[in-house]
């Protein structure tokens, strides 16, 4: 029962985590304009992995996609790659874990196969979560570096007259969504790995017993026979589990009334 709960909870937590990773990847607010001395700004800039946006105090919002691939910073490309890898691994993990769920019966799938699948999905979730956390952290580091660089030359001009105020960017909502989502996916993966240990059948260590039949004698030595768990019994006594799995664009819009809470 505890195994099923752990597996189910791991699946749900990972599902939420992966949904969060997808949401974070699609979000436009990876970096937002720093409102250091002006909490209300007439023009507010924010950027995502795929496009940058400008929201005016008029309510008009304009977003422009990054239509170049070669012209983008290598770090941004790396973050994109990490997030996509995280999503792909997470999606495959979810697919595998659905079939691995103890509460779902698919044909005559053995518990050992479910244990292997649970472990596989768990590892995939862990790697997926790590990819998301790494991607978000790389982007955050890039922001911090740029923030202090732009602070150093915040005011540039001639003869002491302020000409341009450089726009500084700080952490956007997507970073926090990404960190939390990556963490959840990671936790879900660990839970799946823990559940896998419970699903794996224990080796039955029977004592060697000699059965003496009339006429001739046959000695039965115990092997790693599958423990009879779940539905039905292991009538064929096949040695199918040997403990091996037990290791650890451009868009323009005006808002509607519902855009604000």
């Amino acid at each position: 029962m505890a195994v099923t709960a752990c597996q189910g909870l791991g699946f749900v937590v990972s599902l939420i985590g992966i949904a969060g990773i997808i949401a974070a990847t699609c979000m436009d607010q990876w970096s937002t304009q720093d409102l250091y001395n002006n909490p209300v700004t007439a023009v507010f800039n924010y950027q995502g992995l795929w496009r940058s946006c400008v929201r005016e105090s008029s309510g008009f919002t304009e977003c422009r996609g990054y239509f170049t691939l070669l012209g983008l910073p290598a770090m941004l490309q790396a973050v994109r790659a990490l997030m996509i890898v995280g999503i792909v691994l997470g999606a495959i993990g979810l697919l595998v874990s659905i079939f691995a769920l103890k509460c779902i019966r698919i044909g005559s799938m053995e518990d050992s196969a479910k244990a292997n699948m649970t472990l596989t999905s768990g590892i995939m979730f862990i790697v997926s979560g790590l990819c998301a956390i790494a991607g978000v952290s790389v982007f955050a580091n890039m922001l911090v570096t740029n923030f202090w660089m732009s602070t150093a030359n915040m005011y540039t001009g001639m003869g002491g007259m302020v000409q341009t105020v450089q726009t500084r960017y700080t952490f956007g909502a997507a970073l926090f969504v990404g960190w939390v989502a990556g963490g959840l996916t990671l936790i879900g993966g660990v839970m799946m790995c823990i559940a896998c240990r419970g699903l794996a059948p224990e080796e039955t260590n029977y004592k060697a017993v000699s059965y003496h039949a009339s006429g001739h004698s046959v000695a039965y030595k115990p092997g790693g026979f599958k423990a009879s768990t779940g539905f039905g019994s292991n009538t064929k006594n096949k040695k199918i589990y040997d403990g091996g799995a037990r290791t650890e664009d451009e868009v323009q819009s005006y808002p509607s009334k519902h855009d604000y809470v």
Partner: antibody, heavy 115, light 113 residues
Framework: EVQLVESGGGLVQPGGSLRLSCAVS?????MNWVRQAPGKGLEWVAW????????TYADDFKGRFTISRDDSKNTLYLQMNSLRAEDTAVYYC???????????WGQGTLVTVSS | DIQMTQSPSSLSASVGDRVTITCKSS????????????LTWYQQKPGKAPKLLIY???TLESGVPSRFSGSGSGTDYTLTISSLQPEDFATYYC?????????FGQGTKVEIK
């Protein structure tokens, strides 16, 4: 079609108060009050997000003027307190549009502060 | 606050003339996010409310005649009337639309010569 109609202007004594109204019809996301002293240029007074009610004021009017809106009446207000002679002007309500420009203006209402 | 300085404060011109009004801001009005300059131009006739002519420094408001054009970036901007018409005699204002508080130039009065 957006229509803006101001009312509430008139003669008031220095130190007195007055509340201007602007009846709004049509789509308005953010509204402003802009004033123009007789024979002088335009001066922005205040801005309000019509959905959140978030206001912003020019430094000269902070603490004295309050911009607000009534959703049910589709009306924008400017509450003016501690009025001075230099507040004498034609007050316009104006809609902010793409590019942060004022595309629709009311006809204006004259506020005279005099003893 | 961003200061807006218009020049000249007044000018006399004849119908058909090419008129140029300049506006200088104390700070750049160019937004790095979309590479647009947040400067707006208005026309005001006596006893009337101002009329929006140009936004984003060079984008013509719908319904505004094409003889009006705007240019410039950073801190220096220009409004040009290619061929002055009788109805164009008015006062013109530039506006900082980039940051609060929104500020206007002192105005340029275009009079008949």
């Amino acid at each position: 079609e957006v229509q803006l109609v101001e009312s509430g202007g008139g003669l008031v004594q220095p130190g007195g108060s007055l509340r201007l109204s602007c009846a709004v019809s049509g789509y308005t996301f953010s509204m402003n009050w802009v004033r123009q002293a007789p024979g002088k240029g335009l001066e922005w007074v205040a801005w309000i997000n019509m959905y959140t009610g978030e206001p912003t004021y020019a430094d000269d009017f902070k603490g004295r003027f309050t911009i607000s809106r009534d959703d049910s009446k589709n009306t924008l207000y400017l509450q003016m307190n501690s009025l001075r002679a230099e507040d004498t002007a034609v007050y316009y309500c104006a809609r902010l549009v793409k590019g942060n420009g004022f595309d629709y203006w009311g006809q204006g209402t004259l506020v005279t502060v005099s003893s | 606050d961003i200061q807006m300085t218009q020049s000249p404060s007044s000018l006399s011109a004849s119908v058909g003339d090419r008129v140029t009004i300049t506006c200088k801001s104390s700070q750049s009005l160019l937004n790095s996010g979309n590479q647009k300059s947040y400067l707006t131009w208005y026309q005001q006739k006596p006893g009337k409310a101002p009329k929006l002519l140009i936004y984003w420094a060079s984008t013509l408001e719908s319904g505004v005649p094409s003889r009006f054009s705007g240019s410039g970036s950073g801190t220096d901007y220009t409004l040009t009337i290619s061929s002055l018409q009788p109805e164009d005699f008015a006062t013109y204002y530039c506006q900082n639309a980039y940051s609060f508080p929104f500020t206007f130039g002192q105005g340029t009065k275009v009079e008949i010569k």
